[in-house]
């Protein structure tokens, strides 16, 4: 058993049918010695008396808020949560496996630049009685500071019969140098509590591996005289690291017909302009990627050919 | 029909081209190692990230763009900024000093070159003959060192009398390649920055 926060405790259980469970001793936080009784949740049934209560915790029915009283007055509370270990593996019931970029990916994180700021998000089908708390650090043995905000519900989607809820959090490394070569990964730890179930999820990554630039901005077309060709130009996104000559991007320019089945024409360039043939009803899209370290491409920025 | 790739102008700065070749070569070698050594811990998540140049060179600090010198987090271990020399400078009209930067890059390359050559000698003794270092990568290191044109003491190739542990050697190769790729990215960024300046 360990303390998650004041008066909230997590009991770790080897989870299998007929398991013996864990013996837990609760102590009433009071100078009083006599006339103390214990109850669980809203029930008025007295579970025991005395300053300590010993219970055998086996299932969720044994978890909850234990309260000690004296003469009708509440003295203190202890909330017991359960953390299930199923055949050597901690349960992952609360969050959905996003399966990207690999199986067992519960947390996904992205950064728009090398400033040390990143966003993580996760999915669940649970809508109520759910709380998250996020901590992060650079390295684990001698951790350096990363500050995370509160997790917030960022999207709701309908997937078949189920509703899916997306939560996200923003974090910032306390003293980040954009040019630094990372040797210790960022660790992100999410505590999830659903009713009386506790779970924790972790992700470990280097900022360089989760970079996804914003799409190029100010995408413009300039027709070339007496030609079906156009000059496409764009700019680095505002959120990208500076100086741009050091943090350079490479670009992919795509000409896409109205029909998804039409062949796409693509050109790759390090410049912020390119000359392409603009077909009728086609659109021109540009996306960006770090020029030297191949992490994710940005989303497309698009303009119609007409 | 794929349209052609637009090739960047090598500009006034001959080292830019060599540094781009270096990054391409080390990235290819790392990819080959990860495929060939699929049953070894060779992915970024599995290896220990070691920097053989740590406390010996200070490339990131010495080559920091001027714009980042205002960022206190980038100045932690920074003693000196740019000082000039080295043949990669095609023009003397540089507004900042960078010999330390380029010589630091040169020292990095020299250290990795020695490590890779020592390692290749061991890998050639492996009866499995599973993996060897790409000669192209070694040649590209050499070319960039020549372009940087710094004279420094020759580091003797390390030789070991003991029987090599091939498993450990292959894991060390993965660690070295990951670290060298990261350093090659920094070198490329620096060369691009200097070229634009």
């Amino acid at each position: 058993i360990w303390e998650l926060k004041k008066d909230v405790y997590v009991v770790e259980l080897d989870w299998y049918p007929d398991a013996p469970g864990e013996m837990v001793v609760l102590t009433c936080d009071t100078p009083e010695e006599d006339g103390i009784t214990w109850t669980l949740d809203q029930s008025s049934e007295v579970l025991g008396s005395g300053k300590t209560l010993t219970i055998q915790v086996k299932e969720f029915g044994d978890a909850g808020q234990y309260t000690c009283h004296k003469g009708g007055e509440v003295l203190s509370h202890s909330l017991l949560l359960l953390h299930k270990k199923e055949d050597g593996i901690w349960s992952t019931d609360i969050l959905k496996d996003q399966k990207e970029p690999k199986n067992k990916t519960f947390l996904r994180c992205e950064a728009k630049n090398y400033s040390g700021r990143f966003t993580c998000w996760w999915l669940t089908t649970i809508s109520t009685d759910l709380t998250f708390s996020v901590k992060s650090s650079r390295g684990s043995s001698d951790p350096q500071g990363v500050t995370c905000g509160a997790a917030t519900l960022s999207a709701e989607r309908v997937r078949g019969d189920n509703k899916e809820y997306e939560y996200s959090v923003e974090c910032q490394e306390d003293s980040a140098c954009p040019a630094a070569e990372e040797s210790l990964p960022i660790e992100v730890m999410v505590d999830a509590v659903h009713k009386l179930k506790y779970e924790n999820y972790t992700s470990s990554f280097f900022i360089r591996d989760i970079i996804k630039p914003d799409p190029p901005k100010n995408l413009q077309l300039k027709p070339l005289k007496n030609s079906r060709q156009v000059e496409v130009s764009w700019e680095y996104p505002d959120t990208w690291s500076t100086p741009h000559s050091y943090f350079s991007l490479t670009f992919c320019v795509q000409v896409q017909g109205k029909s998804k089945r039409e062949k796409k024409d693509r050109v790759f360039t390090d410049k912020t302009s390119a000359t392409v043939i603009c077909r009728k009803n086609a659109s021109i899209s540009v996306r960006a990627q770090d020029r030297y370290y191949s992490s994710s491409w940005s989303e497309w920025a698009s303009v119609p050919c007409s | 029909r794929n349209l052609p790739v637009a090739t960047p102008d090598p500009g006034m700065f001959p080292c830019l081209h060599h540094s781009q070749n270096l990054l391409r070569a080390v990235s290819n070698m790392l990819q080959k190692a990860r495929q060939t050594l699929e049953f070894y811990p060779c992915t970024s998540e599995e290896i220990d990230h070691e920097d053989i140049t740590k406390d010996k060179t200070s490339t990131v600090e010495a080559c920091l763009p001027l714009e980042l010198t205002k960022n206190e987090s980038c100045l932690n271990s920074r003693e000196t900024s740019f000082i000039t020399n080295g043949s990669c400078l095609a023009s003397r009209k540089t507004s900042f000093m960078m010999a330390l930067c380029l010589s630091s890059i040169y020292e990095d390359l020299k250290m990795y070159q020695v490590e890779f050559k020592t390692m290749n000698a061991k890998l050639l003794m492996d009866p499995k003959r599973q993996i060897f270092l790409d000669q192209n990568m070694l040649a590209v290191i050499d070319e960039l060192m020549q372009a940087l044109n710094f004279n420094s003491e020759t580091v003797p190739q390390k030789s070991s009398l003991e029987e090599p542990d091939f498993y450990k050697t292959k894991i060390k190769l993965c660690i070295l390649l990951h670290a060298f790729r990261i350093r090659a990215v920094t070198i490329d960024r620096v060369m691009s920055y200097l070229n634009a300046s």
């Epitope: 080897d14 049918p17 270990k85 199923e86 055949d87 067992k104 089908t125 | 049953f39």
Partner: antibody, heavy 115, light 111 residues
Framework: QVQLVQSGGGVVQPGRSLRLSCAAS????????MHWVRQAPGKGLEWVAF????????YYADSVKGRFTISRDNSKNTLYLQMKSLRAEDTAVYYC????????WGQGTMVTVSS | SYVLTQPPSVSGTPGQRVTISCSGG????????VKWYQQLPGTAPKLLIY???QRPSGVPDRFSGSKSGTSASLAITGVQAEDEADYYC????????????FGTGTKVTVL
């Protein structure tokens, strides 16, 4: 104590269907994941499928994917394996078992796929 | 394929020490715990070892398990006639848990 009683095995022709059941007692069935495992005559153990405690996630071996469906009815404390398009190579003793560090197995039920 | 490799058979005389190996990879044994089962003819498998080296109550202490890297082993110290059975190791695959992987099985013969 924990008990798993299996039923539904038998002889079936190739291409036909069969449904196995596994009735659980002696524990809170709705709190635990469940597996099906099979063993062809004279061969080793082969994992077939798994279902989470609440039925929300199901996992299958490649050899049965698309043909077998694992399901559970927590109100009846029963686990099921619906087997369709049966093949000769599906002939085996099928076991249900609980998920956990200590597991409990059913007695097994024989499925023979033969024309 | 998701299979852990065991020797097809091992044998020993009563009182001898018998060991069975179970070889896997980084994504299964290298990342997860190992179980060992004993199966007597015509019966369901019985759990002998869980969590690499833990014995459930009721299992004689002559059975012991260990794991090192991507391999595991079961030792029977002082093998007895009633130990003649098939033995299977079991683990999970890191990326596809709870996809369960069994060993190929080992027949233990007591001479």
């Amino acid at each position: 104590q924990v008990q798993l009683v299996q039923s539904g095995g038998g002889v079936v022709q190739p291409g036909r269907s069969l449904r196995l059941s596994c009735a659980a007692s002696g524990f809170t069935f709705s709190s635990y994941g469940m597996h099906w495992v099979r063993q062809a005559p004279g061969k080793g153990l082969e994992w077939v499928a798994f279902i989470r405690y609440d039925g929300s996630n199901k996992y299958y071996a490649d050899s049965v994917k698309g043909r077998f469906t694992i399901s559970r009815d927590n109100s009846k404390n029963t686990l099921y394996l619906q087997m369709k398009s049966l093949r000769a190579e599906d002939t085996a003793v099928y076991y249900c078992k609980t998920h956990g560090s200590h597991d409990n197995w059913g007695q097994g039920t024989m499925v023979t796929v033969s024309s | 394929s998701y299979v852990l490799t065991q020797p097809p058979s091992v044998s020993g005389t009563p009182g001898q020490r018998v060991t069975i190996s179970c070889s896997g990879g980084r994504s299964n044994i290298g990342s997860n715990t190992v179980k060992w089962y004993q199966q007597l003819p015509g019966t369901a498998p019985k759990l002998l070892i869980y969590g690499n080296d833990q014995r459930p109550s009721g299992v004689p202490d002559r059975f012991s398990g260990s794991k090192s890297g991507t391999s595991a082993s079961l030792a029977i110290t002082g093998v007895q006639a009633e130990d003649e059975a098939d033995y299977y190791c079991q683990s999970y695959d890191r990326g596809t848990h709870p996809l369960t992987i069994f060993g190929t099985g080992t027949k233990v013969t007591v001479l």
